[in-house]
Interface confidence: low
């Protein structure tokens, strides 16, 4: 028959967990001995492992609630495909019985004593109630027992006396108008109301008590606006230190509108909260030095050689710059004053050349003169020799870039009768007049 197959058997509770599905045979379900099965929904859960005794169940409740009784527990032979031992089939129950005692003794009823005397009436005039009591001690109950019935009873009583009428206040009258129009001034405004001892008046015979408490009541008026307070200046504070260490600066004195602070619509302080003064350090400010532009590169030379021009011999050249404008202990210029590089000299060297493409059109010249024109050129550009682009001059200093230096003499085939530059000019069209932009604003 098909069963419900589960992926876990919970040993402690004997329950199947993790439903895998139904409609499978026990044999297929128990291909995995960790699985468990149920014959029908809610039926006994059996693990797929080889049969063995389950854990003992918890003890059943004691058969009686007081004095000695007994209680049972059981365990079951569970598993699949076998027996727990000889002659013990799957599903067999084994029982254990033990003595138990939830409570040593059983409760016993007690008995009441005789009723005690009636207590005095609960009131001294008109009608009230009186009470009498009895004790649960004839005999006393045992083992948590009790006496049947009530421990006290009550009945009505009449004092035959007329009660006095005590005074009670009538309702408060309305509040009087307020004694002022704002609060926070010298006299705090109040309102007052009164009441009469007439609801009812105290009786004469027998004499009743007068009304307790005051006949008048005062309170501060609420909802009034606060009285306005005009602001007043506090003293001038100290002059702040001169904020600069050279040249002119500005110091500030401050005062606060807090003696008193303006409140509740009162006017603020008139005048300024700050005043400034010029302070003079009489010390000129330092001026930092700034590098001027680099000078021209010197001729490309090599020590102990008269000329290296047009040779595949690397030389060196340098250029200099000056630190300008440093005054009054300003910062010196940072960086190097001299720049040195490696070079090949191609000064005045005859080199094969090629004509460049046309340059872009230049600016119109003259910009403000008559008939401005623009020009473009093609140049006879020298083809540089294929010398090594880097050299290693000193061991351990690595490779250094080498730059071509000098103005060579390029040789190109003649173009439009020219050997070095071919120029083309065009007039500029629709030229506007040059005007001072400041004059245009007027």
């Amino acid at each position: 028959d098909p069963v419900l197959c589960f992926t876990q058997y919970e040993e402690s509770s004997g329950k199947c967990k993790g439903l895998l599905g139904g409609g499978v045979s026990v044999k297929d379900c128990c291909l995995n001995t960790a699985y468990a099965y149920q014959e029908r929904n809610g039926g006994l859960c059996q693990p797929c492992r080889s049969p063995r005794w389950s854990l003992w169940s918890t003890w059943a409740p004691c058969s009686v609630t007081c004095s000695e009784g007994s209680q049972l527990r059981y365990r079951r032979c569970v598993g699949w495909n076998g027996q727990c031992s000889e002659r013990v089939a799957l599903g067999t129950l084994e029982w254990q019985l033990q003595a138990c005692e939830d409570k040593q003794c059983c409760p016993e009823m007690g008995g009441w004593s005789d009723w005690g005397p009636w207590e005095p009436c609960s009131v001294t005039c008109s009608k009230g109630m009186r009470t009498r009591r009895r004790a649960c001690d004839h005999p006393a109950p045992k083992c948590g027992g009790h006496c049947p019935g009530e421990a006290q009873e009550s009945e009505a009583c009449d004092t035959q006396q007329v009660c006095p009428t005590h005074g009670a206040w009538a309702a408060w009258g309305p509040w009087s108008p307020c004694s002022g129009s704002c609060h926070g001034g010298p006299h705090e405004p109040k309102e007052t109301r009164s009441r009469t001892c007439s609801a009812p008046e105290p009786s004469q015979k027998p004499p009743g008590k007068p009304c307790p408490g005051p006949a008048y009541e005062h309170r501060k008026c609420t909802g009034l606006p606060p009285c306005p307070v005009a602001g007043g200046w506090g003293p001038w504070g100290p002059v702040s230190p001169c904020p600069v260490t050279c040249g002119l600066g500005q110091t500030i004195e401050r005062r606060t509108c807090n003696r008193p602070v303006p409140q509740h619509g009162g006017p603020s302080c008139a005048g300024d909260a700050t005043r400034t003064h010029i302070c003079n350090t009489a010390v000129p400010c330092p001026v930092d030095g700034e590098w001027d532009l680099w000078g021209q590169w010197s001729t490309c030379v090599r020590r102990n050689m008269k000329s290296i021009s047009c040779e595949e011999i690397p030389g060196q050249q340098s250029r200099w710059r000056t630190c300008k404008g440093r005054k009054f202990d300003g910062h010196r210029c940072t960086g190097q004053q001299q720049d040195i590089r490696h070079c090949y000299s191609i000064q005045h060297c005859p080199l094969k050349g090629s004509w460049s493409e046309w340059s872009t059109w230049g600016l119109c010249m003259p910009p403000c003169g008559p008939n401005p024109t623009r020009a473009r050129q093609r140049l006879c550009t020298p083809l540089l020799p294929k010398y090594p682009p880097t050299v290693s001059m000193v061991e351990g200093q690595g490779e250094k870039n080498v730059t071509f230096w000098g103005r060579p003499l390029p040789r190109c085939e003649e173009l439009q009768g020219q050997k070095l530059v071919v120029e083309e000019k065009r007039p500029c069209l629709h030229v506007p007049a040059c005007k001072d932009p400041e004059e245009e604003k007027l």
Epitope: L4, L19, L20, G21, G22, G23, V24, D28, N41
Partner: nanobody, 119 residues
């Protein structure tokens, strides 16, 4: 082989309802188990609800009392009715089928349908 196609996902306000449907085709006679799983961004895929061939159901604690799984063998569909939706139900919901045969089982998954619950 079994093919699964989900439908019914979408955007819904918190407290609203959606009904997801999964249509199975192919060798469906050997399916013993159908289930809905979900995967929120940055989280692992988790079981939402499953139903066996005999109709036994299991639900995740977080959806008990709000979601109901059912199957219609005539139409080869499994449905997840989702009520009282919460923002934390936002995820991609996947239909799953467990196929069981003598030689072993196989898992099949749908492409997923997005469910977004706005606060």
């Amino acid at each position: 082989q079994v093919q699964l196609v989900e439908s019914g996902g979408g955007l819904v306000q918190a407290g609203g309802s959606l009904r997801l449907s999964c249509a199975a085709s192919g060798r469906i006679s050997s399916i013993i188990h159908m289930a809905w799983y979900r995967q929120a961004p940055g989280k692992q895929r988790e079981l939402v609800a499953e139903i066996s061939r005999v109709g036994t159901t299991v639900y995740a604690d977080s959806v008990k009392g709000r979601f109901t799984i059912s199957r219609d063998d005539a139409k080869n569909t499994v449905t997840l009715q989702m009520n009282s939706l919460k923002p934390e139900d936002t995820a991609v919901y996947y239909c799953n089928a467990l196929q069981y045969e003598k030689h072993g089982g196989a898992d099949y998954w749908g492409q997923g349908t997005q469910v977004t619950v706005s606060g």
